[in-house]
């Protein structure tokens, strides 16, 4: 299936160019999404070109500026909130970066009503976080991890928390592990759905070893950072719920959620809460041993100014195959009946599907079903549930979005999506506003995307919120690889693989290959999505093909496939990559003697088993920023598919799945090892422990670090390492520069 | 009802210890946070300490940082103010009173503390 | 710490008489935040208003609190014989929570 064809014709030919590598670097052929800030089931909020604040009614076709540019730069603002009541502005300056989704930032509140700045008990900076509450303008905010609560704007704060300290007790914010492996988020504060409470966790990190690296910056010392950080394994952070009256705060102060009975029994985590009314709020708990979560339903005892969180609302989730969830515990969808709710988990074919819960989860009904896999529940409404699935034409690596018709029975399913821009669109999220009046689908490919605003009614299109015409237009005299999606069968696996080929793709001739690799459980590479990146470039210029696979532990293909690598990572993974690469060469167009692999986090990892596999088939290849051992990750991620690196549970594996224990087998193959030495996430300690294995080997190979870069190598570090990386695999390749 | 009963107050010699309890009847105790106010003979209200309803977390004035302890056990619906190295500057009626730092809803009849040589 | 300022610090009213009570903040506080006690002597005091202006529970309505920021008024609208007392305003917006100095009513 060839979805993105080169347009290239012998009439045009000369004045078509290939892609550049500058082009990539400049980002010169990025695209743009649209998504409405929604404020109400018809208006919604967007920042123009020209910077201003605009809000707009779909119903009435008008807008206006709520907030000038002239607003805006007067603080040097980069991002901007509305309070609900549309009193106020909070304008975000001074952004600070932290890790993945943290960041601090300089906050001012800007008063709507008499265009002026609120002077008088302004806010301490820098903040760590802020938000509004759902109705109304009472701002909660993280200062020095401790929660301060303003029921207006210029009044003076209230603090919630006392007991923070920096890398102690983190209040409303997560420390490093939960913020990158268990909410995906900088917050860790809830307000209910009319502001009446606010729900906060309260982090412990006193007893978590701390990882140190040096920070070299430009002074006459480095200095250190310290981040509690478990390891698998290691002495994990110790969470506690807590919920206060935002009405009269300093009156009963907060009270603390209690954790289930069989989830207290040992280490355990919080995985999320979800308001359900400003009385009832459900909260998701997961053993350490990741294969058990309980959902916890509880209410408000206004008489005992409790939170009651009676053992029948407790709901378990079990996995027997594997973990609990995909990457993360789905969280549920409540109903309007505020007790019954949605849920997406694993069928008893193990498909991942949505479910609706009553009372038990035993009872529960299944709403979809098929071998295929429904992703996400964007909304329910009173007579439609919306969610996404890669169910149309049996792609795993499409997204449709569907309705389902729940006010009549049976429910009736449609597919929004799939016929919209069939060849254009076959990718899609959503974003709804109150009570799905309306949404915006933004579709990323396999075309240029485009970003679309529709009736929540009909479905009807109403405009085109970004279709991408300056880049369609620059890209019209660009040559483009060819690309396709196809799978492969092979012992009763399915390896769904992406091909990107150069534009006079010729079958009959040779081509050097790359494998671009990821990998890691319930990750998905294959998808179709538009990006011209350094591989559109390395296939367009360089005459490359470049191959991504999805083997053994990706997602949305069923358990068997997801769970396939429970307890030994760093087997199949492998295997199927090359197991691929043997498929290709069988297709005639592959160069066996000019055979590369490369992959960055979890890829790199990937990448550095598959050259040291003694295979013979890879000539080269590099590993960015890889894990080398499992010892030496995050204890939330990796016992979650590993268990824990203990004589009496995986210790045999943790030691057998390293890079470290290959090292000799490097010998034959040509290496790139690159890491920043300020990652914060996979520790440039994995990638010195394999330069000293194979310095120990005597195995020669190539390497290069990054200073004061975290796991992303971001600013000018991507240029030098991707001009880096084209240097290595063109001398691998005998490509002329 | 609600009732906050202090007991414990006497005479004691600077430098001394005591300790005060409060039996608290008529709500659910282990969900209010409490706390303790104190008022010097002819003078007005100061706030001494509070503590959430779990016990976990406590709060002092500075004037009684590092001499006092609040604590409580709510199997026994009981507060205790532990004060030790008396001053005569401690001298005072002391209150239990329901609620963190305001308001405080609820109060004891109190119990007298004289710290004198 | 916040200092609140009662004044006066004496009001000699007769009964029936409406009683105008101030407190006044050395930092704003938020209303949410005051309250006003009452306290008779040899008792212990009496929640009278919290949140500023919200009467407690079993207080008469001729009870009532006002203001925001650093100026907060107690009004005892018709002075009742059993109203004779001191009055204390309370902020618990910072911690320490503190009490102003108390305003004595006393019968003229």
């Known amino acids: 299936i060839v979805l993105r064809p080169s347009r290239v014709h012998n009439s045009e030919e000369n004045t078509m160019r290939a892609l550049t590598l500058k082009d990539i670097l400049n980002g010169t052929f990025s695209y743009k999404t649209f998504f409405p800030n929604w404020i109400s089931g018809q208006e919604y909020l967007h920042q123009s070109a020209d910077n201003n604040i605009v809000l707009y009614n779909i119903e009435t076709g008008q807008s206006y500026t709520i907030l000038s540019n002239r607003t805006m730069k007067s603080v040097n603002a980069s991002n901007y909130g509305l309070s609900p009541d549309r009193q106020f502005v909070y304008l975000e300056s001074d952004y600070s970066k932290l890790w993945r989704y943290s960041y601090t930032a300089t906050y001012y509140i800007y008063d709507l009503s008499n265009g002026e700045f609120v002077r008088g008990n302004e806010l301490p900076r820098p903040i760590q976080y802020l938000c509004w509450s759902p109705v109304g303008s009472k701002l909660a905010y993280v200062y020095q991890n401790n929660i301060y609560l303003k029921q207006r704007p210029g009044d003076p704060p209230f603090q919630i928390t006392f007991n923070g300290r920096e890398n102690k007790i983190f209040n409303g914010i997560p420390d490093w592990v939960y913020e990158e492996e268990m909410l995906a988020t900088k917050y860790a504060l809830w307000w209910s759905p009319n502001g009446k409470f606010l729900a906060y966790a309260e982090f412990n990190d006193t007893d978590i070893p701390v990882i140190a690296y040096s920070y070299y910056g430009d002074e006459q010392y480095p200095r250190t950072i310290n981040i509690p950080y478990p390891k698998a394994g290691a002495k994990n952070p110790v969470v506690r719920i807590f919920i206060i009256d935002t009405t009269y705060p300093a009156y009963v102060g907060p009270q603390e959620v209690p954790v289930p009975a069989m989830i207290a029994s040992s280490d355990y985590y919080f995985s999320w809460l979800t308001w359900v009314t400003d009385e009832r709020v459900c909260l998701q708990w997961l053993k350490r041993v990741q294969n058990v979560s309980v959902l916890s339903i509880c209410d408000f005892r206004e008489d005992w100014q409790t939170w009651d969180c009676p053992k029948t609302q407790e709901h378990i989730e079990e996995s027997r195959t594997g973990w609990a969830g995909g990457f993360f515990v789905s969280t549920p969808v409540f109903s309007y009946d505020a007790i019954s709710y949605y849920k997406i988990f694993s069928d008893k074919d193990g498909y991942k599907h949505i479910h609706y819960i009553k009372d038990t989860v035993e009872n529960a009904i299944q709403i979809t079903s098929g071998k295929w896999e429904a992703i996400n529940i964007f909304r329910v409404t009173q007579d439609s549930l919306f969610y996404s699935s890669n169910e149309f034409e049996e792609y795993p690596g499409r997204r449709n979005i569907y309705r389902i018709s729940i006010g009549s029975y049976p429910p009736s399913k449609k597919c929004v999506t799939c016929h919209l821009r069939k060849e254009r669109c076959q990718y899609y999220t959503a974003s709804f506003s109150d009570y799905a009046k309306y949404y915006a689908l933004v579709c990323y490919g396999p075309g240029i995307p485009i970003s679309t605003l529709h009736d929540g009614r009909t479905d009807q299109e109403i405009k085109i919120l970004e279709e991408n015409k300056e880049l369609e237009n620059a890209l019209k005299n660009i040559q483009l690889p060819k690309e396709e999606i196809k799978k492969l069968e092979v012992d009763e696996i399915t390896l769904w693989y992406k091909m990107i080929l150069p534009p006079q793709f010729d079958r009959s001739k040779k081509y050097p290959l790359l494998i671009q690799v990821y990998g890691g459980p319930c990750s998905q590479s294959v998808r179709s999505v538009f990006a011209v990146n350094w591989i559109s470039y390395l296939a367009s210029k360089e005459g490359m093909v470049i191959a991504l696979v999805d083997g053994r532990g990706t997602a949305f293909q069923g358990d068997k496939l997801l769970y396939a690598v429970y307890r030994k990572l760093g087997v199949y993974e492998v295997e199927d990559q090359i197991t691929a690469v043997r498929k290709f060469i069988e297709m005639g167009f592959i160069d066996e003697k000019r055979i590369a692999i490369w992959g960055w986090s979890y890829g790199g990892y990937v990448s550095s088993l598959a050259l040291a596999s003694g295979t013979g088939l890879f000539k080269c290849g590099i590993a960015v920023a890889p894990v080398s051992s499992w010892e030496y990750y995050a204890s939330v991620y990796t016992e979650r598919f590993m268990g824990l690196p203990t004589k009496d549970d995986n210790l045999e594996h943790y030691k057998n799945s390293t890079v470290m224990a290959r090292a000799e087998y490097f010998r034959n193959v040509d290496y790139l090892l690159i890491h920043g030495t300020a990652d914060d996430n996979v520790h440039f300690q994995n990638s010195a422990q394999i330069a000293k294995a194979l310095v120990n080997a005597q195995v020669d190979f190539q390497a290069m670090w990054y200073s004061d870069q975290n796991h992303g190598l971001s600013g000018l570090s991507t240029n030098h390492l991707y001009t880096h990386m084209t240097h290595f695999l063109k001398q691998c390749f005998s490509l002329s520069d | 009802e609600v009732q906050l009963l202090e007991s414990g107050g006497g005479l004691v010699q600077p430098g001394g210890s005591l300790r005060l309890s409060c039996a608290a009847s008529?709500?659910?105790?282990?969900?209010?946070?409490m706390s303790w106010v104190r008022q010097a003979p002819g003078k007005g209200l100061e706030w001494v300490s509070a503590i959430s309803g779990s016990g976990g977390s406590t709060y002092y004035a500075d004037s009684v940082k590092g001499r006092f302890t609040i604590s409580r056990d709510n199997s026994k619906n009981t507060l205790y103010l532990q004060m030790n190295s008396l001053r005569a500057e401690d001298t005072a009626v002391y209150y239990c009173?329901?609620?963190?730092?305001?308001?405080?809803?609820?109060w004891g009849q109190g119990t007298l503390v004289t710290v004198s040589s | 710490e916040i200092v609140l300022t009662q004044s006066p610090g004496t009001l000699s009213l007769s009964p029936g008489e409406r009683a105008t009570l101030s407190c006044r903040a050395s930092?704003?506080?938020?209303?949410?935040?005051l309250a006003w006690y009452q306290q008779k002597p040899g008792q212990a005091p009496r929640l009278l208003i919290y949140?500023?202006?919200s009467r407690a529970t079993g207080i008469p309505d001729r009870f009532s609190g006002s203001g925001s920021g650093t100026d907060f008024t107690l009004t005892i609208s018709r002075l009742e014989p059993e109203d004779f007392a001191v009055y204390y305003c309370?902020?618990?917006?910072?911690?320490?929570?503190?009490f102003g100095q108390g305003t004595k009513v006393e019968i003229k």
């Open positions: 309370q902020q618990g917006n910072q911690i320490p929570p503190t």
């Open positions: 008529g709500f659910t105790f282990s969900s209010y946070a």
């Open positions: 930092q704003s506080v938020s209303s949410s935040y």
């Open positions: 949140g500023a202006s």
């Open positions: 009173a329901k609620g963190w730092f305001t308001p405080f809803d609820y």
